[in-house]
């Protein structure tokens, strides 16, 4: 019997300081570039090695960015989202959604990491 794949969704506020080469990541998404089906949100597609985001360590590829400095990223064109990050200033506050894949074991069996075992 196959295990079921679930997702644990968490939100986090990440404060980044713009480095010499910027914030150090790439994005996909927007109302004109739906990367995820039926979702025009903005997602992190690449973290630049040794960039500000990589050195901070909390932002991950696949994270959805909900807001920048309190400004909602809903219903934005892709290029407008890029511009928003570029013009966000030196100290940048990101509200992000992490989506962690959780692999459950077959029904009736405890997973290896189940603390109740």
């Amino acid at each position: 019997m196959n295990g079921r794949v679930d997702y644990l969704v968490t939100e986090e506020e990440i404060n980044l300081t713009r480095g010499p080469s910027g914030l150090g990541f790439n994005i996909v998404g927007g109302t004109d570039q739906q990367y995820v089906s039926n979702d025009s949100g903005i997602y992190v597609s690449r973290i630049k090695e040794n960039g500000a985001a990589a050195l901070d360590g909390r932002l991950q590829e696949g994270d959805k960015i909900l807001s920048v400095n309190g400004q909602d990223l809903k219903n934005l064109l892709h290029q407008d989202a890029v511009d928003l990050f570029r013009n966000a200033g030196y100290a940048v506050s990101l509200r992000v959604q992490h989506r962690l894949q959780v692999q459950n074991g077959p029904i009736g069996h405890r997973g290896e990491g189940d603390p109740s075992g």
Epitope: S21, G22, L23, G24, F25, N26, I27, V28, Q33, Y35, V44, S45, R46, K48, E49, H78, Q79, V82, F85, R86
Partner: nanobody, 125 residues
């Protein structure tokens, strides 16, 4: 994993034209930032130009002579090279990164790209 394959290089006389192609794998090709770089013998890799979701740009050394375009239906990016000069002789590389950089509209640093083709030789006599 993104794979890039360049083609179209060759030997051309000064003043002539060539069109390089770079075919890419991946279902989200339209979101890629794609760059063209070149490397002449004994020299560092040089930025030629890039194309993103919203536009393209070329380096000052080739501006007005080279243009970059893409065909998302064919997963291919092109480098049209006109008025070629002997100093354009180099191996030309296609590079890709998924998504758009939030730091640079047209990234010119090779470190901004994760995937590279094998290169195609252009010789201008």
């Amino acid at each position: 994993e993104v794979q890039l394959v360049e083609s179209g290089g060759g030997l051309v006389q000064a003043g002539g034209s060539l069109r390089l192609s770079c075919a890419a794998s991946g279902r989200t090709f339209s979101t890629y930032t794609l760059g063209w770089f070149r490397q002449a013998p004994g020299k560092e890799r040089e930025f030629v130009g890039a194309i993103t979701w919203s536009g393209s740009s070329t380096a000052d050394s080739v501006k007005g002579r080279f243009t970059i375009s893409r065909d998302n239906a064919k997963n291919t990016v092109y480098l049209q090279m006109n008025s070629l000069k002997p100093e354009d002789t180099a191996v030309y590389y296609c590079a890709a990164a998924i998504g758009s950089s939030v730091d640079s509209y047209y990234p010119s640093d090779p470190l901004e790209y994760d995937y590279w083709g094998q290169g195609t030789q252009v010789t201008v006599s």
